[in-house]
């Protein structure tokens, strides 16, 4: 199910040097031809084409992946930049481009006789309920979702959300993934801040159930950032 | 093809409240992006709101920030724009939007009405 935990982040309120006018959610863009969307036939404006900030490969488009710009640059600023092509070297799976996946460093060919049940850890979901393609790339899933008949109930091994029944996600546990329940309100959630940080989880939470946001916790508004409790709480 | 169909609209006093709800079915499968649009009599559509594929960012015009909250279910296909304190310039027809995820992202990706397929439209109207 869609994560309701929403971090409103306006996009005009970036780090410099990424949000300059062009960032302003309200802002006119003319449209022009540019980038033919997989699986529709919308064009993307590129005029004024400016970086978008990002915490995580999923925030970006799909030929896309998230890092920072320079070598050894700053942690915290990260930006959408261009997936690798094969032959090229990379350091995770989302780096390479659709049809590609990091082996050795280097981005070689998806093509299944590679992949002999490798799972890749970046899982993303779509807003519909049929998840077995993701905009008819394989990069994000190495395993067929067809493998999946039943909905994983509880603790059962899963890929991603649509794998799990209703109420539960999959979340990583240890080194893989299983169906976990989807918060309720006033119980703590994760709130990330930087990319690092998922990486971190060996125990991680689902989000927040509809009608929930990730929150700071009232009464903790006062401690100091590292002790900071977030809880769902309603919108 | 997304079909997608609004509701929630109607008439509401200054200050009130309003939840507009859209529900996608067909190519669902391919969307990524659900954002709410709106235009008032005589002017252009305007962004008002989005909720990104990644689930972990939303974007809204200036003028609704902190009034506005965009969601989004996914078992039901249905996207939702809560609108509190509402202001007589907030009357406008409400259009829902839908997109696939595209293969490069920019910071206007999500305000660019170009990148969106459409719903009919909900009326909202704000007066006393």
């Known amino acids: 199910t869609l994560n309701s935990v929403l971090n409103s982040n306006a996009i005009k309120n970036l780090p410099p040097p990424l949000g300059g006018a062009a960032g302003h959610p309200g802002s006119a863009v003319s449209a022009a031809p540019g980038i033919l969307y997989p699986g529709g036939n919308k064009y993307q404006t590129i005029d004024n084409y400016q970086p978008y900030p990002c915490a995580e490969d999923e925030e970006c488009g799909t030929d896309e992946y998230c890092a920072s710009p320079t070598r050894g640059g700053d942690a915290g600023v990260q930006i959408c930049l261009a997936c690798r092509k094969r032959r090229k070297r990379c350091m995770r799976h989302a780096m390479c481009c659709p049809g590609n996946y990091c082996k050795n460093g280097i981005c070689v060919s998806s093509d299944q006789n590679h992949f002999r049940g490798e799972i890749e850890e970046t899982i993303t979901e779509s807003f519909g309920n049929d998840h077995s393609t993701l905009d008819g790339y394989s990069r994000r899933t190495t395993l067929s979702s067809k493998m999946y008949h039943t909905k994983g109930q509880e603790g059962s091994v899963c890929l991603r959300s649509s794998d799990c029944a209703s109420g539960l996600c999959c979340a990583r546990h240890f080194w893989s993934k299983i169906c976990k329940p989807v918060l309720k309100e006033g119980q703590v959630c994760t709130k990330h801040r930087r990319k690092g940080s998922h990486g971190l989880e060996i125990f991680q939470r689902c989000y927040c159930g509809e009608g929930l946001s990730c929150r700071i916790q009232k009464d903790h508004h006062q401690a100091s950032n590292s002790s900071r409790l977030h809880t769902c709480q309603r919108h | 093809e997304v079909q997608l169909v609004e509701s929630g609209g109607g008439l509401v006093q200054p200050g009130g409240s309003l939840r507009l709800s859209c529900a996608a079915s067909?190519?669902?499968?391919?969307?990524?992006?659900m954002g709410w649009f709106r235009q008032a009599p005589g002017k252009e559509r305007e962004f008002v709101a989005a909720?990104?594929?990644?689930?972990?960012?939303?974007h809204y015009a200036d003028s609704v920030k902190g009034r506005f909250t965009i969601s989004a279910d996914n078992s039901k296909n249905t996207a939702y724009l809560q609108m509190n304190s509402l202001k007589p310039e907030d009357t406008a027809v409400y259009y829902c939007?839908?997109?696939?995820?595209?293969?490069?992202?920019?910071?206007?990706?999500?305000?660019?009405?170009?990148?969106?397929?459409w719903g009919q439209g909900t009326l909202v109207t704000v007066s006393s």
């Open positions: 909720i990104s594929w990644s689930l972990s960012r939303t």
């Open positions: 939007a839908a997109a696939p995820r595209p293969k490069r992202v920019s910071v206007s990706y999500f305000s660019t009405a170009s990148n969106y397929d």
């Open positions: 067909g190519s669902t499968s391919s969307l990524r992006t």
